[in-house]
């Protein structure tokens, strides 16, 4: 057989943040290459990453057509320089990768407070809507487009001169708190789907406060 | 366990307000929405519409905007479901349903038979 | 808002066999489809969501699939404890919305 010296992947993990995602797998090679198919339970396989010495392949491009698919890979293990031999069942080696729901397992990244603004007592957060690369009538998607009401923010504030953190959150990409007049505060921001039992929280903002040089007003 | 207990049964007359409640346990109540379905004698299901249990906002079906009004009680994890102006063809067994990530329900209370008749 | 067409209204098989409900939706609705069982008396309960994915407990030979506006929700092997009617229902876009129903009984 010609794949004496080819071994078949294993470890294929999906890496995925905010729908950019990428499947991972080991070894990395040794004399042989690899080739990446994807496909959904009811769908044709598709090829991704022809014959490559990576040991990861940019799926987005294909998840990003239905977020709400289940996708399953697989990696196909060929000698290198020889990637018309197969194994002794006349198929090349390969393994599958586990399921992988977009929608229910895309990890959220790390958020981004736009601006503030203080009017009186209150203050007005707002949260960077960022953009995925989910499309619809070529447009790209926000990542508020996408989840809708299942996406909400969770808001850490805090004065300045104390460490006691309060917390507000919002289903929309903007909060209004009360604040004591005179004192600078804090902000930072989780995004969360709490109805999810994976990955459902984001790390945490940068920590933006007031009366810091960027100012209350912040494109 | 998760389980959303709802009230017993109602007779109403018509022209009259119906408030149906529906307890939820064994799980986070704020971070799920609640929705209602009510299906009529030998007929499909229907959505009225859902809340967030968390800010009280909802969202109403477009057909029972005029009539429908659901709030929450967060201190005893309890949403209700308020319908006026009832008539006959209100008669139905009401279900509040659980909104899972993404949109399916899966979780739904036992129902509660509403009946208008005069 | 968007209909959803559920076929056949009613349909009787035999125990053991494979029985396909079809569902369309009047729009693209992705792959935003849940299925439903209801037996008599009883609350409905999700089988399928996203068109294809089993909900939690609900045994293999329950399957769904589709894409778009046409859908089929699939039993391989029609049990006794399968009598029920069963529904679909879109949560692509508000307000959700179900199809008539399918009743399926044993011959």
């Known amino acids: 057989s010609g794949t004496t010296n080819t071994v078949a992947a294993y470890n294929l993990t999906w890496k995925s943040t905010n729908f950019k995602t990428i499947l991972e797998w080991e070894p990395k090679p040794v004399n042989q290459v690899y080739t990446v198919q994807i496909s959904t339970k009811s769908g044709d396989w598709k090829s991704k990453c022809f014959y490559t010495t990576d040991t990861e392949c940019d799926l987005t491009d294909e998840i990003v057509k239905d977020v709400k698919q289940t996708y399953l890979a697989r990696v196909f293990s060929y000698p290198a320089g020889n990637v018309e031999s197969t194994g002794s069942a006349g198929e090349p080696l390969y393994e599958n990768s586990p399921e992988f729901t977009p929608y229910l397992e895309t990890n959220l990244g790390q958020p981004t407070i736009q601006s503030f603004e203080q009017v009186g007592t209150k203050v007005n957060v707002t949260v960077e809507d960022e953009r995925t690369l989910v499309r619809r009538n070529n447009t790209f998607l926000s990542l508020r487009d996408v989840f809708g009401k299942d996406l909400i923010y969770t808001l850490y504030y805090w004065k300045s001169s104390s460490s006691g953190k309060k917390t507000a959150k919002t289903n929309t990409n903007e909060f209004l708190i009360d604040v004591d007049k005179g004192e600078n505060y804090c902000f930072s921001v989780q995004a969360v789907i709490p109805s999810r039992t994976v990955n459902r929280k984001s790390t945490d903002s940068p920590v933006e406060c007031m009366g810091q040089e960027k100012g209350e007003f912040r494109e | 366990e998760v389980q959303l207990v709802q009230s017993g049964a109602e007779v109403k007359k018509p022209g009259a307000s119906v408030k149906v409640s529906c307890k939820a346990s064994?799980?986070?109540?704020?971070?799920?929405?609640m929705n209602w379905v009510r299906q009529a004698p030998g007929q499909g299901l229907e959505w009225m519409g859902e809340?967030?249990?968390?800010?009280?906002?909802?969202t109403y079906n477009q057909k029972f905007k005029a009539r429908v009004t659901m709030t929450v009680d967060q201190s005893t994890s309890t949403v209700y479901m308020e319908l006026s102006s009832l008539r006959s063809e209100d008669t139905a067994v009401y279900y509040c349903?659980?909104?899972?990530?993404?949109?399916?329900?899966?979780?739904w209370g036992q129902g509660t038979t509403v009946t208008v008749s005069s | 808002s968007i209909q959803m067409t559920q076929s056949p209204s009613s349909l009787s098989a035999s125990v053991g066999d494979r029985v396909t409900i079809t569902c369309k939706a009047s729009?693209?609705?992705?792959?935003?489809i849940a299925w439903y069982q209801q037996k008599p008396g009883k609350s409905p309960k999700l089988l399928i969501y996203?068109?294809?994915n089993r909900y939690t407990g609900v045994p293999s030979r329950f399957s769904g699939s589709g894409y778009g506006t046409d859908f089929t929700f699939t039993i391989s092997s029609l049990q006794p404890e399968d009598i029920a009617t069963y529904y679909c229902?879109?949560?692509?876009?508000?307000?959700?919305?179900f199809g008539g129903g399918t009743k399926v009984e044993i011959k």
């Open positions: 996203f068109a294809s």
């Open positions: 064994g799980y986070s109540f704020t971070g799920y929405y």
């Open positions: 349903a659980r909104r899972e990530l993404g949109g399916p329900f899966g979780y």
């Open positions: 229902q879109q949560d692509y876009s508000s307000p959700w919305t």
């Open positions: 809340i967030n249990p968390s800010t009280g906002g909802s």
């Open positions: 729009q693209s609705v992705s792959s935003g």
